[in-house]
């Protein structure tokens, strides 16, 4: 079919000419104003320069408008997270405007063509914002713009565009090909709103990242360490979501970002959290579970202004569904070690028993290796509120039985065949709720037993020398 | 009220071009995807694709590329529905059929059908 | 392409009995906890009206006697009681956000 778009990003119907003169040029954005939570309901159009379709349709002026803003589509149709977002606009601000920007015509192209519609469409909704503003009551301050994929590109290239700067930009998996390592004026950046909040849920080192790898934000938020996001996984996918392929392994991490903001808005009462760190990595170890000098943030529609930062990279652990919240603690274990434990890592398992619920056996991630008479600390994670801490169990896992492990145990065994076994000697262990900031120690409880060897367990209660416990918590910490 | 009304049956011959109209009324027709469906007889339902009735942008199903082309007449409230170098196996009858853009993609209102026969 | 499965392709149910018609999708047609299937009704001569969307959901101006049920990849359509104007061709439909959709073969029903 004959491409139906102008120079100036405008919309010609060459399909069909009653008249060979005629040509009917219509604008390439549309701005539907949802009226209602139906997501069948056709909701209002609005243009520029028509009052008469805000009138009908309540728009109110003094209220938060969102503008949500589509990525680029194979497909050509709203996929079902728009209405899920809808809804959920809806139901947490009441008396919002939720306005869904399409741009469907120059998004249904090939990803260079699009991306290079993107600036068209963020002038758009600038000319729209601008137009409201010429309003009363109307505040630019009131306007949140959510773009998701090469839609958050669009949302700043408005908030470039727009006369004033708009309250705030969410970036919901920013779109990475053709940005990463862009200009600040070529792709979403922290100047293109008063805040501007990302959560990157696609992000790869090797191969194409989806979503953009580089914090462009004043909060970068990065869930899972950005990339593999749990519940998305091939297997998970043949189960659950329609087609099975890695297509859809790309699109549910991709778009767990846009679920992500929904649990935010819906499940209110289960604010996940992000911890500011400089790398996956040193999150993954544990290192990151401060929220001292505004370290910490709500994610999504909950997160707090923080003006002050520029990207700042955050991140937390989630569920694989809604709600996503998970629990974080980070264990310091001073390990002492009176036997060669030779090259093998040890496959470490900690259960927590809590006031409210016990555990799992959760294993304790080794980002790099075990140091052996020093603290090593550790992440770890549970699905459910286990109240204040009672005990834990630490189980050392027999040997796994990979064929590197098994030459490895018969290589110490022929160098020490007197003394095969190995031992490490945990007298203690400190324990930081990042959701609490509280901090509580641990010890054996016979201080006489505290080695442990593979395939054994070892107990710990709260020390009986009076157990850490700082009140001092973060501002938003109080708000769980 | 709601109303999607096709143009009335057509015989052609293989090889022939036939063009199929579904007239829109009681609501905004560029604020709802317009599909088609082909119902061979004794046959069921099979998708053909559809079409973006602001943009004009058509989508067709695999085993509808080529011979079919999906237009509209927007300021008429018409879409259409081409059907090129006829073969035997066209005999059907068409269906279109809109859909929300915003919601769940179901197909709410249908039109009454056209039936083509085509015949040698 | 999702293919779906009826069963059975025609059924004789009694009138004021219950009838049951099954739809399985070749993969699940479930998004964040909705299931995009929809069921339709075609009488002769007639072009198909919508009776359930999102598995679940009564279309305008249908008698309750109609449910649907389901998800994932197996979908139930339930008339309950049955009466003399249900005689009819039903055909489940999936609506997942990336076409092709498609629908079921179809299931006949007769009143004895």
């Known amino acids: 079919s004959p491409v139906p778009f102008g120079p100036e990003g405008r919309l010609e119907d060459k399909l069909h000419k009653p008249k060979a003169t005629q040509t009917e040029v219509k604008p390439s954005v549309r701005f539907n104003l949802r009226t209602s939570k139906d997501p069948e309901h056709e909701g209002c159009y609005l243009s520029v320069g028509h009052s008469q379709p805000l009138e009908d349709c309540s728009f109110n002026m003094t209220a938060k408008t969102f503008f949500i803003i589509h990525g680029w589509t194979m497909s050509g149709i709203f996929e079902n997270w728009l209405h899920k977002l809808v809804s959920a606009l809806h139901t947490r601000e009441k008396d919002a405007n939720v306005v869904v920007v399409d741009w469907l015509p120059l998004a249904h192209q090939l990803y260079t063509d699009a991306v290079n519609n993107t600036r068209v469409v963020g002038h758009s909704i600038a000319r729209m914002l601008d137009w409201l503003q010429e309003k009363d009551d109307f505040s630019l301050g009131n306007v949140h713009l959510i773009g998701y994929s090469l839609g958050a590109h669009v949302a700043g290239y408005a908030g470039n565009f727009v006369k004033g700067t708009v309250g705030r930009i969410t970036g919901l998996d920013p779109a990475g090909p053709m940005f990463e390592g862009a200009d600040i004026h070529k792709r979403l950046s922290p100047d293109d709103a008063d805040f501007v909040d990302v959560l990157h849920t696609y992000t790869r080192s090797f191969g194409l990242s989806i979503g953009i790898q580089m914090p462009v934000g004043h909060i970068d938020i990065y869930p899972n360490g950005g990339d593999f996001q749990p519940g998305c996984g091939l297997n998970d996918v043949l189960g659950s979501i329609a087609y099975g392929t890695i297509t859809e392994v790309v699109k549910c991490e991709h778009e767990r970002a846009v679920h992500l903001f929904v649990d935010s808005l819906v499940n209110q009462d289960k604010p996940s959290f992000a911890f500011q760190c400089t790398d996956s990595n040193r999150f993954k170890k544990g290192i990151c579970l401060s929220c001292r000098k505004n370290r910490c943030n709500n994610i999504g529609y909950n997160a707090k202004k923080m003006r002050k930062k520029r990207n700042s990279k955050m991140y937390l652990k989630t569920r694989a569904g809604m709600p996503f919240k998970v629990y974080h603690y980070q264990l310091k274990v001073h390990m002492f070690s009176y036997n060669n434990s030779g090259d093998t890592q040890p496959t470490l398992y900690i259960t927590l028993y809590g006031s409210n619920a016990d555990s799992q056996n959760l294993p304790l991630e080794i980002v790099e290796k075990i140091e052996l008479n020093a603290t090593n600390t550790f992440l770890v994670y549970t699905e459910e509120d286990l109240g204040d801490l009672l005990k834990m169990r630490l189980t050392w896992e027999g040997v796994a039985h990979s064929w590197y492990n098994l030459w490895n145990e018969f290589r110490n065994y022929l160098s020490q065949p007197s003394n095969p076994s190995r031992e490490l000697y945990i007298r203690r262990i400190r324990v930081k709720s990042g959701e609490t900031q509280r901090k509580v120690t641990f010890c054996t409880q016979d201080p006489t037993k505290s080695s442990i060897s593979p395939g054994q367990e070892l107990w710990f209660h709260k020390c009986q020398d009076g157990w850490k416990m700082k009140n001092k918590t973060s501002p938003f910490v109080n708000l769980a | 009220q709601i109303q999607l009304v096709q143009s009335g049956p057509e015989l052609k011959k293989p090889g022939e071009t036939v063009k199929i109209s579904c007239k829109a009324s009681?609501?905004?027709?560029?604020?709802?995807?317009m599909n088609w469906v082909k119902q061979a007889p004794g046959k069921d339902l099979k998708w053909m694709g559809w079409i973006n009735t602001y943009s004009g942008v058509p989508t067709y199903a695999d085993d509808f590329k080529g011979r079919f082309a999906f237009s509209l007449e927007t300021s008429a409230s018409t879409a259409y529905l081409q059907i090129n170098n006829l073969k035997n196996e066209d005999t059907a009858t068409y269906f279109c059929?809109?859909?929300?853009?915003?919601?769940?993609?179901?197909?709410?209102?249908w039109g009454q059908g056209t039936t083509l026969t085509v015949s040698s | 392409d999702i293919v779906l499965t009826q069963s059975p392709a025609s059924l004789a149910v009694s009138l004021g009995q219950r009838a049951t018609i099954s739809c399985k999708a070749s993969q699940s047609v479930d998004y964040d906890g909705d299931s995009y299937m929809n069921w339709y009704q075609q009488k002769p001569g007639q072009p198909p009206q919508l009776l359930i969307y999102a598995a679940s959901n009564l279309g305008s101006g249908i008698p309750a006697r109609f449910s649907g049920s389901g998800s994932g990849t197996d979908f139930t359509l339930n008339i309950h009681p049955v009466e003399e104007e249900d005689a009819a061709t039903y055909y489940c439909?999936?609506?997942?956000?990336?076409?092709?959709?498609?629908f079921g073969g179809g299931t006949k029903l007769e009143i004895k």
């Open positions: 059929a809109r859909f929300s853009y915003y919601g769940r993609h179901y197909f709410d209102y």
């Open positions: 009681g609501y905004t027709f560029t604020n709802y995807g």
């Open positions: 439909h999936q609506s997942t956000d990336d076409p092709p959709w498609t």
